[in-house]
Amino acid sequence: GSVKVLHEPSCFSDYISTSVCQWKMDHPTNCSAELRLSYQLDFMGSENHTCVPENREDSVCVCSMPIDDAVEADVYQLDLWAGQQLLWSGSFQPSKHVKPRTPGNLTVHPNISHTWLLMWTNPYPTENHLHSELTYMVNVSNDNDPEDFKVYNVTYMGPTLRLAASTLKSGASYSARVRAWAQTYNSTWSDWSPSTTWLNYYEPWEQHL
């Protein structure tokens, strides 16, 4: 039967080592057996490379392509093949389609003056362009009360957030997660980090009276 692409490839780059493309076929497809995504940097002498896609869902394919440390001028030619049949052809500029890596190692520590110190790691090495470009969103939610959640935008450089324990319900269990974006690259948000959970044992001042 004829092989057709329902939703053409959408690609994002972490701007350091990997670009990921995802697309949807018009019927359930064994992506790795039936399809190949070829990619070639538009640069004199560059070679053609092949990515073997994997299934994300029945008819959704995803391809992770190792790329060199991206620079703004890089443009890739992409061709999606089903055997000898060219299904789709397009170009992709990593610097224009950035999805930052997920922040890592989110931890919560008790700090002075009844505050919690949330810390995480910047997912980029200092020499990478994105290291100094990231801002973060921290989501803090009550594990037992879906209505009790707060969102904090961290627009300063350090990957930390100080949280007054008094802003959270005493005795409740809270979870936090963090994601990143790069404003100057007009990026999308990264995936959320894994959640970390802690018990807010702060006693309201009234209980001391």
């Epitope: 940097l41 640069f43 004199m44 002498g45 560059s46 070679e47 053609n48 490379h49 190792p66 790329i67 060199d68 620079v71 703004e72 001028a73 890089d74």
Partner: antibody, heavy 125, light 112 residues
Amino acid sequence: EVQLVESGGDLVKPGGSLRLSCVASGFTFRDYAMTWVRQAPGKGLQWVSLINGTGGKTYYADAVKGRFTISRDNAKNTLYLQMNSLRAEDTAVYYCAVDRLTKTIRPQYYGLWAWGQGTLVTVSS
Amino acid sequence: DIVMTQTPLSLSVSPGETASISCRSSQSLLYSIGYNYLDWYLQKPGQSPQGLIYLGSKRASGVPDRFSGSGSGTDFTLRISRVEANDTGVYYCMQGLQSPLTFGQGTKLEIK
């Protein structure tokens, strides 16, 4: 030690054909793009053609496009230049040179970092 | 095509002095920060060309540090300090960024 040895240069009549060869040693031939550069008597250097490491992509100067074909045999560590429809203005010493490393996603550039001794092509009636 | 223009076309320098050769390109050779695709080559009399400088300022293997390259974008300079008799020959700049690769006209260096 890197060595490039060209051969195949000769005296040929206008409209004739010639095939130049360049045998490489001392480096991993298949990993590098290769280039032909020529030099007409008493003139400067002129780039002719480039082929990437696998041979999948080729580039030509406008002056030779459609007449010259660059190719390579990685099993034999040999670069070729097939020259057809030769003209008097193709008279030159032809050099092969090692160009960029192409096994990486973005080719790594070191300039034309090794050159052969050259082979003379004379096109005259 | 990118046009490469060298100045001067000939140069006469006394031993021990510094020689400077300029090369200008009709388009920027800067692909990304620190990556100017501009090379310098020397062709000594009766010999094949040899690489001196690549990516604007990086010395090729075995090239003495008397040779230095500088510049970015469209303007580049080759400097040869403490010139020696052995430096005689024709110096060429070349852009390696895009096809067709193009050379400058060459600068003939003569040692007085």
